[in-house]
Amino acid sequence: HEGVHRKPSLLAHPGPLVKSEETVILQCWSDVRFQHFLLHREGKFKDTLHLIGEHHDGVSKANFSIGPMMQDLAGTYRCYGSVTHSPYQLSAPSDPLDIVITGLYEKPSLSAQPGPTVLAGESVTLSCSSRSSYDMYHLSREGEAHERRFSAGPKVNGTFQADFPLGPATHGGTYRCFGSFRDSPYEWSNSSDPLLVSVTGNPSNSWPSPTEPSSETGNPRHLH
């Protein structure tokens, strides 16, 4: 859909990973003066939400409150702007935003090889494992928008595991992992306990780096 206006932006506050029963704000905004914003969840016929746009300093926006979070609220969202109502003249869609519900199943374990403290430039691998038969593991880094996803390997010693090679360490961070099942890509487990990875002998040991995106800028198209 091309739209009569360029696409608005869609952000999740505080982020796109939402604990069960908690609320997330999806903010649709644009520098086009839209009078109306619509929020649509992919594949849903009934649940398109409509809000009147607010205008401040050349920006129009609408804050859609989604929650308390349940399985049927998770999914891929897009927002649209319109300067008219009945009929709407919709803009191009925002980039898609995957909203994930977490806290549904038992937490996996997260560990680091060779260990959570590594020398700068040394390779580090994070391993996520669980006795639950998760098909997929997701690794998130605090303050970063993009999760990484790996398929769980075959059962070994009673656990299902995925390894995330981080490559040569440059600066540390706090990591968490989640498990999910193939048939429910938007429904994730409880978070693992956080794992702090520290890099020693590195001048830029501060984290996150100033160029990294914040957790509210949306997340990638990788759930399907």
């Epitope: 016929f45 009934k46 398109t48 009929p87 919709l90």
Partner: antibody, heavy 120, light 111 residues
């Protein structure tokens, strides 16, 4: 003025398929939701499913899942409902109805209906 | 068997008030708004009440809707002969993921 113009009456054999069209005028077709509702002779209304052309989203009532296909052609402002594996119980008047994007299930305009008769 | 339950018929004399009930469950009326449609013989249905109690423009204020819990009702006051029609309630059902209708109520205006 909004109008939903439906295709003409059809007589079909059991086991065959029927495709009913609904051409919209007087509005931005793609920015609305189109539903299909049927009514068997002397019976009540039954929602079959709907489509929002701009979102490419089609939803089907569980009863018709796998047997009905709802599509839309934005270039001609026309929605279609195809029902397969017809049986005598599918003899009914088939209506298309329009809703706003954010009130997709509030049917504010209706077509006049298309009578589909299934008979051997 | 319709998901929403309506009485099959209702009647009254001109000028009277007639009320039609529509009973559902927590997955439809209990958690979603109710719309009412009126169907004159041989014609397509027409929206009469939306969002429980709102009238589209052109619908006289003799028609009113209400909702409480898992039930809704439509009231017609000052009944007129042209009100003879079938009346249907409808709501979204979260469990069925679709629109459900009542079986319809035939309103007769007695001479």
């Amino acid at each position: 003025e909004v109008q939903l113009v439906q295709s003409g009456a059809e007589v079909k054999k059991p086991g065959s398929s029927v495709k009913v069209s609904c051409k919209a005028s007087g509005g931005t077709f793609s920015s609305y939701a189109i539903s299909w509702v049927r009514q068997a002779p002397g019976q009540g209304l039954e929602w079959m499913g709907g489509i929002i052309p701009i979102f490419g989203t089609a939803n089907y009532a569980q009863k018709f899942q796998g047997r009905v296909t709802i599509t839309a052609d934005e270039s001609t402002s026309t929605a279609y409902m195809e029902l397969s594996s017809l049986r005598s119980e599918d003899t009914a008047v088939y209506y298309c109805a329009r809703g706003e994007l954010d009130t997709a299930i509030r049917f504010d305009y209706w077509g006049r209906g298309t009578l589909v008769t299934v008979s051997s | 068997q319709s998901v929403l339950t309506q009485p099959p018929s209702a009647s009254g004399t001109p000028g009277q008030r007639v009320t039609i009930s529509c009973s559902g469950s927590s997955s439809n009326i209990g958690s979603n708004t109710v719309n009412w449609y009126r169907q004159l013989p041989g014609t397509a249905p027409k929206l009469l009440i939306y969002s429980n109690n709102q009238r589209p423009s052109g619908v006289p204020d003799r028609f009113s809707g209400s909702k409480s819990g898992t039930s809704a009702s439509l009231a017609i006051s000052g009944l007129q002969s042209e009100d003879e029609a079938d009346y249907y309630c409808a709501a979204w059902d979260d469990s069925l993921n679709g629109v459900v209708f009542g079986g319809g109520t035939k309103v007769t205006v007695l001479a």
